[in-house]
């Protein structure tokens, strides 16, 4: 039975040209995390594999940095980065947990970030 829950940074906004941290945290389960995928629509941005570490898609290697933790840092944001991002935790024996984050990249300097949390 899947008992875990994923907390995310929720809906967040950031300024064009700036950077943002996408963060998810899996709790309430003792399942082993074997891999975390970060996806945007049908594109795989990055993978953090328990054995092989981080691998960033060649399409994003100049603008995506791994971490902190199992999170992902997006840099040099453009308006086209606006949209849904998914953290997909592959675990054993539970299976797959998915978290959703909506990022809005704003032209103005009044971008306000949604509530953040610190991973303990």
């Amino acid at each position: 039975m899947m008992t875990g829950t994923i907390e995310t940074t929720g809906n967040i906004s950031a300024e064009k040209g700036g950077s943002i941290i996408l963060q998810c945290h899996l709790s309430s389960t003792t399942a082993q995390v074997t891999q975390v995928n970060w996806e945007q629509q049908d594109q795989l941005l990055a993978i953090c594999n328990a054995d092989l570490g981080w691998h960033i898609s060649p399409s994003f290697k100049d603008r995506v940095a791994p971490g902190p933790g199992l999170g992902l840092t997006l840099q040099s944001l453009t308006v086209n980065d606006t949209g849904e991002y998914f953290c997909i935790y592959h675990t054993y024996p539970d299976g797959t947990y998915t978290g959703r984050i909506f990022l809005e990249v704003l032209e103005s300097s009044v971008a306000e970030h949604g509530a953040r949390f610190q991973i303990p």
Partner: antibody, heavy 118, light 110 residues
Framework: EVQLVQSGGGLVKPGGSLRLSCEAS????????MSWIRQAPGKGLEWVSR????????NYADSVKGRFTISRDNAKNTLYLQMNSLRAEDTAMYYC???????????WGQGTLVTVSS | SYELTQPPSASGTPGQRVTISCSGS????????VNWYQQLPGTAPKLLIY???QRPSGVPGRFSGSRSGTSASLAISGLQSEDETDYYC???????????FGGGTKLSVL
């Protein structure tokens, strides 16, 4: 130019051994995981083995586990595949390739033919 | 056994659009991105599409990829005679802890 140059194939009897080499140039070899992939005559591609960038972690396909050993020498920019207890079914073109395969293998060696026959 | 299933053959006429399918499971295509390779006779495979739909530099825009659930497809539009060769899909497989390749599809340009 980014390239992988392979050597070490040939004809070997069943039960014999062979070592393949793959020399990298044009990129920082020590930054990349590397893999071996093979292709039996007229057949499809089969992943054989992988080693991480510093050589501390390796993985093998079940078909070669316990018989093949992947290794690397980052000082020499070279990847190796030691093949022992060879069988007729190991006959194939062997390719080295850059990466573990999550986002595909972007650089391939030219291939080296291994024939296991008595 | 672990499997990505491709049709053994496909065909089209010059200028036409053809698609090649690749079917997998939750442990591979359902969990990781799909990559496609083109292999000309007597040469090493060449990466054609990575991360489901991304083209490496130098690959013509006629080639495109998509993924849905546990299946993927490669589309080739404006088919040309030089496209007549073998195509392989691949995806990382969690159980194999390595990439899994499809059996390959031989494309004929009629």
């Amino acid at each position: 130019e980014v390239q992988l140059v392979q050597s070490g194939g040939g004809l070997v009897k069943p039960g014999g051994s062979l070592r393949l080499s793959c020399e990298a140039s044009g990129f920082t070899f020590s930054d990349y995981s590397m893999s071996w992939i093979r292709q039996a005559p007229g057949k499809g591609l089969e992943w054989v083995s992988r080693i991480n960038s510093d050589g501390s972690r390796t993985n093998y396909a079940d078909s070669v586990k316990g018989r093949f050993t992947i290794s690397r020498d980052n000082a020499k920019n070279t990847l190796y595949l030691q093949m022992n207890s060879l069988r007729a079914e190991d006959t194939a073109m062997y390719y080295c390739a850059r990466g573990p395969g999550f986002f595909g293998f972007d650089i391939w060696g030219q291939g080296t033919l291994v024939t296991v026959s008595s | 056994s672990y499997e990505l299933t491709q049709p053994p053959s496909a065909s089209g006429t010059p200028g036409q659009r053809v698609t090649i399918s690749c079917s997998g499971s939750r442990s591979n295509i359902g969990r990781n991105s799909v990559n496609w390779y083109q292999q000309l006779p007597g040469t090493a495979p060449k990466l054609l599409i990575y991360s489901n739909n991304q083209r490496p530099s130098g690959v013509p825009g006629r080639f495109s990829g998509s993924r849905s659930g546990t299946s993927a497809s490669l589309a080739i539009s404006g088919l040309q005679s030089e496209d007549e060769t073998d195509y392989y899909c691949a995806a990382w497989d969690a159980r194999l802890t390595g990439p899994l390749f499809g059996g390959g599809t031989k494309l004929s340009v009629l």
